[in-house]
């Protein structure tokens, strides 16, 4: 007898793990044999869908490899034309071990800003997310919170927040850990100790001290009156993210000195500045001929003659000392082109060292005059003819310019290195060379002869003077 379909085993909720098999059973009694169809969320499951297997005349639906998207309500409908169709429904709950779908990444953040370390998860039951910092579970506080999404939010990031983090997703089926990421907290450069202003006497040594901190550790640069410091020595040390810079200066003019601490945050820089003034106290007496300052020789004419990086005296009685003194040597230098090969190097050495006098520290940065012995060596040995001719022209008034008078020293007014070797400058080009002694011409003098000390002979010249030389 025909019999309307009856579902004898209604569908039940099925729990399945991802990638496992899930089976719904829909046992039907009827005659004739019913047609059984299956739907998921009211959408017909096609018989030829390879993800499913339908067996036992349609009474068994098997999902061959469960995906999380298979979640939903599955219904079977039986119909054999006798009576109405019957339906039974059941849910598929896809159970899933925790999975971290958006793991945290390394973060560099500036102190005081908000940091968010992402940690998006999947899983069923819904995983709970916690965080580990270093080796310990992270405790939430007023600045730190784990968001609904699982991400970690840190307000007003502080240096102590820096470290290694990982998120942990956990449900009844298991636990997932993210890889360890680094939170780096960068701190804007900040000056801890600003340089102090000084009021000093001309020629004093002053040390300006500047201490700064930041992450990364800042670099310190010094600026003098708006330009990079050209002289002075800088000593730096770094300890516990603090950089300490000391600028030692030989004070020959007042200045504004600025300490600039800089560090880099990605493509941007942060800087902190502090300035100090160095002023020069009034002297009790005028400086007379010593008005000027010491600086590295930056000219061209005397490059080969003066020692490399030599500090020379620049006379501020000229508006532009460097230019004026360079012009002075340049003018005289051109006239030396006509003198004898014996005289020329000696005269050039005398000229350059007379116009750009060597600087000496001690009292103040004063020019050291050329030693009398060297002046006389040029005058009476190397350039005797030329010197006479020049003095003659000067007496006859053929030299209208004061240039020549300024560029030729008066030997008798120069100190002797015999009486004080630190009172005057030597001309290395004329130093005594034991291998190639040349005797000075005899000189009439009531004073005893004086030894020129054996100084290292200069490789840049073959000139030498005899160790015995009369003084005037």
């Amino acid at each position: 007898l025909p019999k309307a379909p009856v579902i004898t085993t209604p569908l039940e909720t099925v729990d399945a793990l991802v990638e496992e098999v899930a089976t719904f059973m829909c046992a039907v009694e009827s005659y004739p044999q019913p047609e059984i169809s299956w739907t998921r969320n009211k959408i017909l499951i096609k018989l030829f869908d390879t993800r499913y297997s339908i067996r036992e005349n349609g009474q068994l639906l098997t999902i061959l490899s469960v995906e999380d998207s298979d979640d939903g309500i599955y219904c079977c409908t039986a119909n054999n034309g006798v009576g109405g169709a019957v339906e039974s429904c059941g849910a598929l709950q896809v159970k899933m071990k925790p999975k971290i779908t958006r793991p945290p990444i390394n973060v560099k953040i500036i102190e005081g800003l908000k940091a968010v370390l992402p940690c998006t998860t999947m899983g069923n039951p819904k995983p709970s997310v916690s965080w580990i910092k270093g080796d310990s579970p992270l405790r939430e506080n007023s600045r730190t919170a784990v968001l609904e999404s699982g991400s970690l939010r840190i307000h007003n990031v502080q240096k102590e927040d820096a470290g290694q983090y990982r998120c942990v997703a956990k449900n009844s089926l298991g636990t997932a850990y993210s890889k360890v990421v680094k939170l780096e907290v960068e701190v804007f450069a900040r000056i801890l100790r600003a340089p102090e202003s000084h009021n000093v006497t001309f020629g004093s040594f002053v040390t300006l001290h500047c201490t700064a901190t930041g992450i990364p550790v800042p670099t310190i640069t010094w600026i003098e009156n708006g330009n990079a410091v050209s002289s002075g020595s800088i000593q730096e040390s770094v300890k516990d993210r603090v950089i300490d810079s000391r600028l030692q200066l030989f004070i020959t003019k007042p200045g504004l000195y600025t300490c600039i601490a800089t560090n880099k945050h990605g493509e941007k820089f942060s800087t902190a500045k502090a300035a100090a003034t160095v002023s020069i106290a009034e002297w009790s007496k005028p400086q007379k001929d010593n008005k000027g300052y010491c600086a590295q020789y930056r000219g061209e004419v005397c490059n080969a003659v003066l020692a490399k990086d030599a500090l020379v005296f620049l006379n501020t009685s000229y508006a532009d000392p460097e230019e004026a003194q360079e012009l002075l040597v340049h003018t005289a230098w051109n006239e030396l082109k006509v003198v004898s090969p014996l005289c020329r190097p000696a005269a050039e050495a005398l000229l350059c060292n007379h116009v750009f006098q060597e600087c000496s520290p001690g009292v103040v940065p004063t020019p050291i005059p050329i030693c009398r012995e060297y002046c006389l060596a040029v005058k009476e040995l190397f350039c005797a003819k030329e010197w006479l001719a020049m003095e003659e022209k000067t007496h006859r008034g053929l030299y209208r310019s004061e240039m020549h008078l300024l560029s030729v020293p008066e030997c008798s007014k120069l100190p002797s290195m015999h009486w004080d070797p630190t009172a005057c400058a030597r001309l290395p080009h004329l130093d005594y060379n034991k291998e190639n002694p040349k005797t000075f011409p005899p000189m009439t003098s009531s004073k005893p002869s004086v030894d020129i000390p054996n100084l290292p002979s200069s490789s840049s010249s073959s000139f030498s003077v005899s160790p015995t030389y009369s003084m005037t």
């Epitope: 007496k285 020692a307 120069l414 009486w419 070797p421």
Partner: antibody, heavy 115, light 111 residues
Framework: EVQLVESGGGLVQPGGSLSLSCVAS????????MNWVRQAPGKGLEWLSV???????YYADSVKGRFTISRDNVKNTLYLQLNNLKPEDTALYYC?????????WGQGTQVTVSS | EIVLTQSPSSVTASAGEKVTINCKSS??????????LAWYQQRPGQSPRLLIY???TRESGVPDRFSGSGSTTDFTLTISSFQPEDVAVYYC?????????FGSGTRLEIK
């Protein structure tokens, strides 16, 4: 030969004054820096003052405001005026030629400050 | 001011022995490629005498057994072969900045 001969030392009471002189010979005095250095009995050397070729003077802090250095290039003489003397100023006072090194020394003159 | 620390404070040596005296400056005395440090000898009852200037240049008339070395802040006076006439107190002095300062001295005695 360089000669530096100091004079003017003696016994003086605390608060008193003295004027030391140093006559230089054998070199062109005006072209050189001159110094005063002292040595207390059984003690080390103490630099006091220097005067440059333009008569600009510099002093150690211990004597600043009390001692005055000066020179007379015509007389080839270096001076040190000592005022407001203290017992700790008792020493042998040397006149010394030299710019940054102290090259030639006199024999010294003794200053004793005692009541 | 620059402080010069001399060591040792005294040393006893035999004739022919090598003697070294050290002088450490509280800051660099190097300026314009010269070290402004000098060494002096003061024999008993005599005025001091300059031995070495610019750290290593021997003053004329000083025996070549005396030599100076060092740079920036650390300096040494060496007597290569000590002689009885070298019994004295030795001082270092900086001429780098006023006030010029001396070390406290090293007394050199004969064994």
């Amino acid at each position: 030969e360089v000669q530096l001969v100091e004079s003017g030392g003696g016994l003086v009471q605390p608060g008193g004054s003295l004027s030391l002189s140093c006559v230089a010979s054998g070199f062109t005095f005006s072209l050189y820096y001159m110094n005063w250095v002292r040595q207390a009995p059984g003690k080390g050397l103490e630099w006091l003052s220097v005067i440059d070729t333009h008569s600009i003077a510099y002093y150690a802090d211990s004597v600043k405001g009390r001692f005055t250095i000066s020179r007379d290039n015509v007389k080839n003489t270096l001076y040190l005026q000592l005022n407001n003397l203290k017992p700790e100023d008792t020493a042998l006072y040397y006149c010394v030629l030299g710019r940054t090194a102290l090259v030639r020394w006199g024999q010294g003159t003794q200053v004793t400050v005692s009541s | 001011e620059i402080v010069l620390t001399q060591s040792p404070s005294s040393v006893t040596a035999s004739a022919g022995e090598k003697v070294t005296i050290n002088c450490k400056s509280s800051q660099s005395v190097l300026y314009n490629q010269k070290n402004y440090l000098a060494w002096y000898q003061q024999r008993p009852g005599q005025s001091p005498r300059l031995l070495i200037y610019w750290a290593s240049t021997r003053e004329s008339g000083v025996p070549d057994r005396f030599s100076g070395s060092g740079s920036t802040t650390d300096f040494t006076l060496t007597i290569s072969s000590f002689q009885p006439e070298d019994v004295a107190v030795y001082y270092c002095q900086q001429g780098y900045s006023v006030p010029y300062t001396f070390g406290s001295g090293t007394r050199l005695e004969i064994k």
